[in-house]
Interface confidence: low
């Protein structure tokens, strides 16, 4: 689509005369007729294909004719098309003498005409004037001449339709050959696809509007290069979305189990060293001086009884040390100077000689103990707490201090690790030597049965166009992502295919 | 499954009316373009009418602006070409098109199309 502007510059009839050469009473009122056509080889009557306009009376015999609006009539004379302009033209200009105000050519007198002339040729669409003038016996006519795009049409032929525009199907102006330039932040075939913020990640961000960066689902961050690991991760990180790969030191599904209590909690007191031995367990060696799970408990080495013959036990801060009784000497009051004849033996001993007299034993009875049966027996030195368990004296009894897990009087009994129900959703639970072990039930799994299992959404390949799919475990749908040039919830439509065809 | 299917089609005398009716399955169909197009035999596809899916700004070839009216029912999944003061040259088969955006007038996917006749 374009037009044909034909601009009239001066027009000369010095006698006033008619093309038959009688002369015009009082003088030639001329208007001009313009057809434009189809190239023709000899300009031949017929319609005028590419258009005709008239002008109004713009002069008598010999005038200039203004640039602007002249009598009603435009100049340039426009003479628009709706087609693809050809390249090719056969323009005819007919210069008429009007008697009256009736310019129609059925109100003029037959031999009204002036002149006439006709030309032909090629003509390339443009901004610049052509500029011809045309001489006849008694007339010449000077004029200009050129073919420019309508509004919206660009291209050689005027045959490119390209109008500007800012909206949801493209943001863009349009460049003098028709092809589109795109407003700032927008790219594409039609500008419609805009340009994301600076470093956003081409597969895990998009955008809607230019300079920003949307994330798709499983990933975050300015510019969405950051996983979201498994929902109720607590001590993990990812690679890829929805993982949970464990800090050092912790484990199970969510990281939540640790591994590392020694360092974490830093359970053993009084220097003691601590052994990680499992999911939050631990074992403490103490130092000399201590006992207790956690060497919490100071050991005063009298305890133990070392002094012998009804020597007493003195605590020092390096150790200990015993006051022996008359008769005894030696670290633990072990060696004697007595004999039988000096009664050593205590609570009904019976005294025997040994070595000549030089020595002699003691014969204890039940409940004592000791060279010289000065103590009672230590119920703990049968070692009768089971497990692990620490033996107290009470008294004349004693008693197990047993270790997490197991009770009873001598720490026989297993506490059952089943007693709290620590298996989620209906799994069945079992009682292990050191701990326990969960069955769970279809849909579950984990150590305690916690972790529903997921079913892969993305299995049945739900993603078209060689999306990624994604499963998303906490509502088990899938997400794809999709390559560029592809929309839709499954990646299934393509998007700025180049029209089908031509309008 | 990208479906669109063409109906209202007929014979029509000059300066009568029908309406077409192209119901849209396969797609979100609000989030999208749809418009008319139409082949007369031994002629160029020409296209007639577009309306968009954000705000229903509608566009019509200057051969049937005043006389067609393109209208969308985002409930029904339809889109409507009202033609009134129907025309001999507006003789044709009509087809309707779905655009994924690439331009308004730009279509990826189109129906079988309705025969509309005008004649005497």
């Known amino acids: 689509s374009g037009v044909f502007q034909l601009q009239l510059q001066e027009f000369i009839n010095e006698r006033g005369v008619l093309a038959s050469g009688r002369p015009c009473e009082p003088g030639c009122r001329t208007f001009f007729r313009v057809c434009l056509k189809h190239f023709q080889a000899v300009v031949s009557p017929g319609p005028c294909t590419f258009g005709t306009v008239s002008t109004p009376v713009l002069g008598t015999n010999s005038f200039a004719v203004r640039d602007d609006s002249s009598g009603g009539g435009r100049n340039p004379l426009q003479l628009p098309f709706n087609f693809t302009w050809p390249g090719t033209f056969s323009l005819i200009i007919e210069a008429w003498h009007a008697p009256g105000d009736d310019l129609r050519p059925e109100a003029l007198p037959p031999d009204a005409l002036i002149s006439k002339i006709a030309i032909q040729g090629s003509l390339a669409v443009g901004q610049n004037w052509l500029l011809d003038e045309q001489t006849s016996t008694l007339t010449r006519l000077r004029y200009s001449y050129r073919v420019i795009c309508s509004d919206n049409y660009y291209g050689d032929n005027c045959s490119r339709l390209c109008k500007k525009r800012n909206d949801h199907f493209g943001h863009y102006v349009c460049q003098p050959d028709g092809n589109l330039s795109c407003l700032p932040g927008w790219t594409g075939e039609y500008c419609q696809q805009p340009i994301c913020l600076s470093g956003c990640h081409e597969q895990n961000g998009y955008c809607s509007k230019p300079a920003e960066c949307l994330c798709r689902p499983g990933w975050q961050g300015r510019l969405c290069n950051e996983c979201i690991p498994h929902n109720g991760c607590r001590h993990g990180t990812c690679s890829t979305p929805w993982q949970c790969t464990c800090d050092e030191g912790w484990g199970g599904l969510f990281c939540d189990q640790d591994l590392n209590y020694c360092t974490h909690h830093s359970p053993c007191k009084n220097g003691a060293t601590c052994s990680n031995s499992g999911q939050r367990s631990y074992t403490c060696t103490c130092r000399p001086g201590y006992t207790g799970v956690d060497c919490e408990l100071e050991l005063s080495e009298c305890d133990s009884n070392p002094c012998r013959n009804g020597g007493s036990c003195k605590d020092q801060e390096d150790g200990y040390h015993c006051l022996c009784p008359p008769g005894y000497y030696g670290l633990h009051c072990e060696h004697s100077t007595l004999s039988c004849a000096d009664s050593p033996c205590f609570n009904g001993g019976s005294c025997r000689e040994r070595n000549q007299g030089a020595n002699y034993a003691c014969e204890c009875p039940p409940n004592f103990t000791g060279s010289n049966c000065e103590k009672k027996v230590d119920r703990c030195t049968s070692n009768p707490c089971a497990n692990g368990g620490q033996c107290l004296n009470r008294g004349p009894s004693r008693m197990c201090r047993c270790r997490p897990g197991f009770t009873g009087t001598y720490c026989e009994l297993h506490v059952s690790d089943c007693a709290r129900n620590p298996c989620a959703h209906g799994g069945t639970c079992h009682d292990l030597e050191n701990g326990l072990m969960c069955t769970c039930p279809a849909g579950f799994s984990g150590r305690r049965c916690e972790v529903r299992t997921s079913i892969d959404a993305c299995a049945s390949s739900p993603c078209f166009n060689r999306a990624t799919c994604y499963t998303d475990l906490s509502t088990d749908t899938f997400v794809c992502n999709c390559p560029y040039g592809f929309v839709g919830s499954r990646c299934e439509f393509p998007v700025g295919l180049p029209p089908s065809f031509p309008w | 499954e990208v479906q669109l299917v063409e109906s209202g089609g007929g014979l029509v005398q000059p300066g009568g009316s029908l309406r077409l009716s192209c119901a849209a399955s396969g797609f979100t169909f609000e989030n999208y373009a749809l418009g008319w197009f139409r082949q007369a035999p031994g002629k160029e596809r020409e296209w007639v009418s577009c309306i968009s899916s954000s705000d229903g700004t509608t566009y019509y070839a200057d051969s049937v602006k005043g006389r067609f009216t393109i209208s969308r029912d985002n409930v029904k999944n339809t889109v409507y070409l009202q033609m009134n003061r129907l025309k001999p040259e507006d003789t044709a088969i009509y087809y309707c098109?779905?655009?994924?955006?690439?331009?308004?007038?730009?279509?990826?996917?189109w129906g079988q199309g309705t025969q509309v006749t005008v004649s005497s």
């Open positions: 098109a779905l655009s994924l955006g690439s331009s308004w007038c730009a279509y990826d996917y």
